[in-house]
């Protein structure tokens, strides 16, 4: 049997026998275009494609629509994989989304959605989520039904205000909604009573900016 040389996600890489976490090259569905992603081969059985990571504030997340579309940052540290790739990938097969969160007091929590996909750019990469479980709140901190994606230069929220400009970062803002994992990074002891921080309301409550976040996806049938 001929060895697979291109992979659409980290689950395929894991199943090929490459089971060490790290940076791998993925290929866009039905294309030869490539993208580098961090693959988490340790959490919950491995095979996770990391689509977002925050840990230290080293990367500016107040970026343009184009940058969020194409991705930015470093897969070894803080980064956004790219809306276009994630939209194409999650449009081909059913994916689950796992969001891992860390606070400044040493606690960790997660939210798991059993079906996740992004609509195409023509629909502003609207997020679709179902089936929430996990420890980071019984109510989804990403508003349901899903919102369109907004950035500082593309205002698609459900608010007469401009959520992305006020709250910082690109996100699926509602009006403006209970979360923003792409907000401004605040260090410890400066992370409370912040409206533009890294927020997951139904875990940490009002105005709390988190220490670290990871968003990762994997095929539902993995």
């Amino acid at each position: 049997k001929e060895e697979q040389t291109t992979f659409r996600d980290c689950a395929e890489i894991f199943k090929s026998g490459l089971t060490t976490s790290g940076i791998y090259t993925l290929t866009f569905p039905n294309s030869t275009e490539e993208i580098k992603a961090y693959c988490d081969m340790d959490v919950g059985g491995g095979g996770w494609t990391v689509i977002q990571h925050r840990e230290d504030g080293s990367v500016d997340f107040q970026r343009t629509w184009k940058e969020y579309k194409e991705g930015f940052g470093s897969p070894l540290g803080e980064y956004w994989l790219g809306n276009e790739f994630v939209s194409q990938l999650t449009g081909q097969h059913r994916y689950v989304l796992k969001i891992q969160l860390k606070d400044w007091e040493g606690n960790e929590a997660h939210s798991l959605y059993d079906h996740f996909y992004l609509a195409g750019e023509e629909s502003n990469y609207r997020i679709h989520l179902t089936g929430l479980t996990g420890t980071a709140g019984k109510i989804s901190s990403i508003s349901q039904p899903g919102s369109d994606f907004s950035t500082k230069d593309s205002d698609n929220d459900k608010c007469i205000c401009k959520c992305s400009q006020m709250l910082s970062g690109g996100w699926w803002f509602d009006a403006c909604g209970p979360s923003n994992l792409n907000g401004q990074y605040y260090p410890q002891k400066q992370n409370t009573n912040k409206f533009n921080g890294i927020k997951w309301y139904y875990w940490k409550g009002s105005g709390y900016s988190l220490k670290a976040t990871t968003m990762m996806i994997r095929p539902a049938d993995f």
Epitope: S143, C159, I160, C161, K162, Q165, M166, L167, D174, A175, C176, G177, P178, N193, K194, F195, N196, K199, Y201, S206, G207
Partner: nanobody, 123 residues
């Protein structure tokens, strides 16, 4: 400790005007995403009336749009609600609240609240 204190309520006639004030101590209003005015009529749920975002943008409930105006004075750390052409259905306790999160029209997302000031509009 954060304290929001409302003032300016009272008894007025239909068609009259009233200006409510909300003063903050222990925090500047600029730290909030939104400062909102909510109202609660007897036997009814608390509802959003008007709000002002950190950016200065404003929002109004359909029932008050065109009659009420929200503004703020950063130097005085005070938010105002100018209420014109008052109607009997505007009778309620009016609350000032500050929010860091969530959808602006949902009371549950607001963290800090005042004690309220009563507005009664009689015919």
């Amino acid at each position: 400790e954060v304290q929001l204190v409302e003032s300016g309520g009272g008894l007025v006639q239909v068609g009259d005007s009233l200006r409510l004030s909300c003063a903050a101590s222990g925090r500047t209003f600029s730290t909030y995403l939104m400062v909102g005015w909510f109202r609660q009529a007897p036997g009814k749920e608390r509802e959003f009336a008007a709000g002002i975002w950190s950016s200065g943008d404003t929002a109004y409930a359909d029932s008050v749009r065109g009659r009420f105006t929200i503004s703020r004075d950063n130097a005085k750390n005070t938010v105002y609600l100018q209420m014109n052409s008052l109607k009997t259905e505007d009778t309620a306790v009016y609350y000032c609240a500050g929010s860091y999160d969530g959808n602006y029209y949902i009371p549950g997302f607001y963290k800090d609240w005042g004690q309220g000031t009563l507005v009664t509009v009689s015919s």
